[in-house]
């Protein structure tokens, strides 16, 4: 089968600081040296890009400076962290992997990770 399978967890709960981490793992049909990883958010059948990074195998994942994502790679596994999340950002986050080089190109799309974000309760003022 000429297809690339991408696995990611079904559900992740963001921390109280609005940080969510999950692993995106892909079964590579070829020996790629250049890989692009994109995180997409799907809400009401609308898909928007959250962040993207291209990396050379063996090198670190580098997102843009203003990106809300960070990540590390190890073989065919990418550890993704999304920060600055709020309750309104709760939704399905899809990991998309593209084997860019060498040919042939392969596309892999995960089933998505449902990230739940709960805004922390504000601390009550304390009287001393």
């Amino acid at each position: 089968c000429k297809a690339m399978h991408v696995a990611q967890p079904a559900v992740v709960l963001a921390s109280s600081r609005g940080i969510a981490s999950f692993v995106c793992e892909y079964a590579s049909p070829g020996k790629a040296t250049e890989v692009r990883v994109t995180v997409l958010r799907q809400a009401d059948s609308q898909v928007t890009e959250v962040c993207a990074a291209t990396y050379m195998m063996g090198n670190e994942l580098t997102f843009l400076d203003d990106s809300i994502c960070t990540g590390t790679s190890s073989g065919n596994q990418v550890n993704l962290t999304i920060q600055g999340l709020r309750a309104m950002d709760t939704g399905l986050y899809i990991c998309k992997v593209e084997l860019m080089y060498p040919p042939p190109y392969y596309l892999g799309i995960g089933n998505g990770t449902q990230i739940y974000v709960i805004d922390p309760e504000p601390c009550p003022d304390s009287d001393f």
Partner: antibody
Framework: QVQLVESGGGVVQPGRSLRLSCAAS????????MHWVRQAPGTGLEWVAV????????YYADPVKGRFTISRDNSKNTLYLQMNSLRDDDTAVYYC???????????WGQGTMVTVSS | EIVLTQSPGTLSLSPGERATLSCRAS???????LAWYQQKPGQAPRLLIY???SRATGIPDRFSGSGSGTDFTLTISRLEPEDFAVYYC?????????SGQGTKVEIK
């Protein structure tokens, strides 16, 4: 709104060159792979070439490899197809298309006709 | 290269009838990477279905896609006058990107 507009088609003699352009608007051009697809009169769709994101990675269909060059200028939101050594069987309507977030070709231009004839 | 074969070549039906179009792949295609397009004369193709079964934005629910492996189907539950056109299936999971030869749905 999201739009692709091709230009540059015309009638050209075999062996000559032509450059097609595709102007994009309404979306972040550099975030998408862009394809050229052609359709010879009365036939189906034939994929021609793709260029990804920053423009470093390109792929071509075998019939055009070595003759056609795909490029993009992200600062101008424009995709190009330089067609050299044109042959009769390159006669077709040429479409540019965007590779959507989930991979399918979700936005298409209206097409530009290229006729190779002596 | 993955070869896609569509059948029938032409489908002659009346408005209100159900249309069933087939697309068969020469090797297994992940359902995540199969699309259907509609093309009317003198117009560009329009994305109808992606991921074998998900409708693109603005596509009416009379269009549905199904299938997996090597066999995929596009169904139009009740043909409207504007549905008479040519339909193409396409795989986009690996290069080269390939399409079927098309099925023409014409008015009987």
């Amino acid at each position: 709104q999201v739009q692709l507009v091709e230009s540059g088609g015309g009638v050209v003699q075999p062996g000559r060159s032509l450059r097609l352009s595709c102007a994009a608007s309404g979306f972040t051009f550099s975030s998408y792979g862009m394809h050229w697809v052609r359709q010879a009169p009365g036939t189906g769709l034939e994929w021609v070439a793709v260029i990804w994101y920053e423009g470093r990675n390109k792929y071509y269909a075998d019939p055009v490899k070595g003759r056609f060059t795909i490029s993009r200028d992200n600062s101008k939101n424009t995709l190009y197809l330089q067609m050299n050594s044109l042959r009769d069987d390159d006669t077709a309507v040429y479409y540019c298309a965007r590779a959507g977030d989930l991979g399918a070709f979700d936005i298409w231009g209206q097409g530009t006709m290229v006729t190779v004839s002596s | 290269e993955i070869v896609l074969t569509q059948s029938p070549g032409t489908l002659s039906l009346s408005p209100g009838e159900r249309a069933t179009l087939s697309c068969r792949a020469s090797q297994s295609v992940s359902s995540s990477y199969l699309a259907w397009y509609q093309q009317k004369p003198g117009q560009a193709p329009r994305l109808l279905i992606y991921g074998a079964s998900s409708r693109a934005t603005g596509i009416p629910d009379r269009f549905s896609g199904s299938g997996s492996g090597t066999d995929f189907t596009l169904t139009i539950s009740r043909l409207e006058p504007e549905d008479f056109a040519v339909y193409y299936c396409q795989q986009y999971g690996s290069s080269p990107w390939t399409s079927g030869q098309g099925t023409k749905v014409e008015i009987k």
